[in-house]
């Protein structure tokens, strides 16, 4: 008996071939001997089966001795043994129809779980293997689960169902909803304008939800809300904003915030959350602000940084085009009685200067 695997919703073509290359009488029946379709001369006739409106054949092939049964919009319950009667012979074809669906919406938040459920005919014992867009393989039986979805899991998942050494392939498009970056850091000199951007890693037709930015300033004992906003069809509208600092928010995506001035009291870490309509859970992006200040008070030249810096960062004070006068892995450095000239305060790591502030020291007479 020949085995054919089909996909729910698809069309399948079961073949039946006569030895004579001409149009002769044929019938297709199911395992209950109920006629599905056949021919009377050059006319297609249909029987009383449940497939009536979804069954068809290809008349153009009859003259060649081919009498296929075409079943459209396959259902799991179409799984059966189909018998083609032609020339006093019976050809049996076992059709097994499978369906693979995501348990919920195919748009899932980063960190959520994806469950794929296989619908299969009674008596079958298929195995399933799915490959994610980033090449991760998962296998199982009736259900497959992937926990902690990552941004790289967005795209087409290819799943192969294996039964009776035959296979059928399903493709499921999954969209992982997330920000492009989980975390970012901005380095600014005191007084400079600060731009925070929160680009999303996905595009959808309509995007509706609400969000909030909580800020934990390094100098503050607790965090506070800086801004709340709504998102309607990709349009951003501010609901509430703190008066200190005077934040401004862009009206279009990507989400964009402007802090008019970087000040030491604002240095710290923020957490932007975005709740999307009809989704449980929230998207998160951490943002960090490091602020540098260089000052001269009487005979003391000081450079300070505030904010979440790595303990490996080096803070240096140097006279332009000269060796550093002082370099420390600390958040403040100073030089007493500095020479006149242009001094540079540098915040650097192993690979680059991250932040630089210049201060002019005038000669003392």
């Amino acid at each position: 008996k020949k085995v054919v695997l089909g996909k729910k919703g698809d069309t399948v073509e079961l073949t039946c071939t006569a030895s004579q290359k001409k149009s002769i009488q044929f019938h297709w029946k199911n395992s209950n001997q109920i006629k599905i379709l056949g021919n009377q001369g050059s006319f297609l006739t249909k029987g009383p089966s449940k497939l009536n409106d979804r069954a068809d054949s290809r008349r153009s092939l009859w003259d060649q001795g081919n009498f296929p049964l075409i079943i459209k919009n396959l259902k799991i319950e179409d799984s059966d043994t189909y018998i083609c009667e032609v020339e006093d012979q019976k050809e049996e074809v076992q059709l097994l129809v499978f369906g693979l669906t995501a348990n919920s919406d195919t748009h899932l938040l980063q960190g959520q779980s994806l469950t794929l459920t296989l619908e299969s005919p009674p008596g079958s014992s298929p195995s399933v293997q799915c490959r994610s867009p980033r090449g991760k393989n998962i296998q199982g039986g009736k259900t497959l689960s992937v926990s902690q979805l990552e941004l790289q899991d967005s795209g087409t998942w290819t799943c192969t169902v294996l039964q009776n050494q035959k296979k059928v392939e399903f493709k499921i498009d999954i969209v992982v909803l997330a920000f492009q970056k989980a975390s970012s850091i901005v380095y600014k000199k005191e007084g400079e304008q600060v731009e925070f951007s929160f680009p999303l890693a996905f595009t959808v037709e309509k995007l509706t939800g609400s969000g909030e930015l909580w800020w934990q300033a390094e100098r503050a004992s607790s965090s506070k809300s800086w801004i709340t906003f709504d998102l309607k069809n990709k349009e951003v509208s501010v609901k509430w904003v703190t008066q200190d600092p005077k934040l401004q928010m862009g009206k279009k995506l990507p989400l964009h915030l402007t802090l008019p001035q970087a000040l030491p009291q604002y240095a710290g870490s923020g957490n932007l959350t975005l709740a999307l309509e009809a989704k449980t859970g929230k998207l998160h992006q951490e943002v960090n602000l490091v602020v540098m200040r260089a000052t001269q008070l009487q005979k003391n030249l000081t450079c300070e940084v505030w904010g979440p810096t790595s303990p490996k960062l080096m803070l240096s004070l140097k006279l332009e085009n000269k060796e550093a006068k002082v370099s420390k892995r600390e958040k403040a450095v100073w030089v007493l009685n500095p020479e006149a000239g242009m001094w540079q305060c540098l915040l650097s790591d192993s690979g680059q200067v991250l932040l630089e502030s210049n201060i002019k020291v005038l000669p003392t007479w």
Partner: antibody, heavy 122, light 107 residues
Framework: QVQLVESGGGVVQPGRSLRLSCAAS????????MHWVRQAPGKGLEWVAI????????YYADSVKGRFTISRDNSKNTLYLQMNSLRAEDTAVYYC???????????????WGKGTTVTVSS | AIQMTQSPSSLSASVGDRVTITCRAS??????LGWYQLKPGKAPKLLIY???SLQSGVPSSFSGSGSGTDFTLTISSLQPEDFATYYC?????????FGQGTKLEIK
Amino acid sequence: QVQLVESGGGVVQPGRSLRLSCAASGFTFSSYGMHWVRQAPGKGLEWVAIIWYDGNNKYYADSVKGRFTISRDNSKNTLYLQMNSLRAEDTAVYYCTREVALEGYYYYMDVWGKGTTVTVSS
Amino acid sequence: AIQMTQSPSSLSASVGDRVTITCRASQGIRNGLGWYQLKPGKAPKLLIYAASSLQSGVPSSFSGSGSGTDFTLTISSLQPEDFATYYCLQDYNYPYTFGQGTKLEIK
């Protein structure tokens, strides 16, 4: 392509000196911190030293502090490790590796040489 | 110096198994931790940086998690080429320190 090639290893007596070199190619050498990491026979990896992109800052493992000096010549795209007062426990494969620094926040060693073997024995 | 304690020191597993290796720092290191794979006669290979970021070109069967003092490397389904020694490295502060290593062997 990005490549690091170590040289200068060999057999040396305890108390003597040796200088290792690491030739870098395929990337802007002067924009990266560079490390030396070693593995003694039958032991695990041990971090040895780092030098910053401009050569101004250097840090060492306690086990080599005062005996080893890391340096670089950005014009020659070369990293060095001067090893003085060598001991039997310095016997190891020495790797040079590049450090990527992202936003002053994330760090990782993404490119490694194949290593050069140093044997300290009398 | 920050001490890194890695466990187990060795581990026997079969192809297809899920394996977990842990690393504990003697003090908080935020997410300043990387995982490296070492095979005999080869250069070490970066797998995970910043505790959970997968290095480009590394199979997605590898994943990292944790923050602060406790970190985990998970291999979801072992492949024959995954049998090697794995090391954690704290790169939060100088001097950098490696864990003692975990040798992953075929059962």
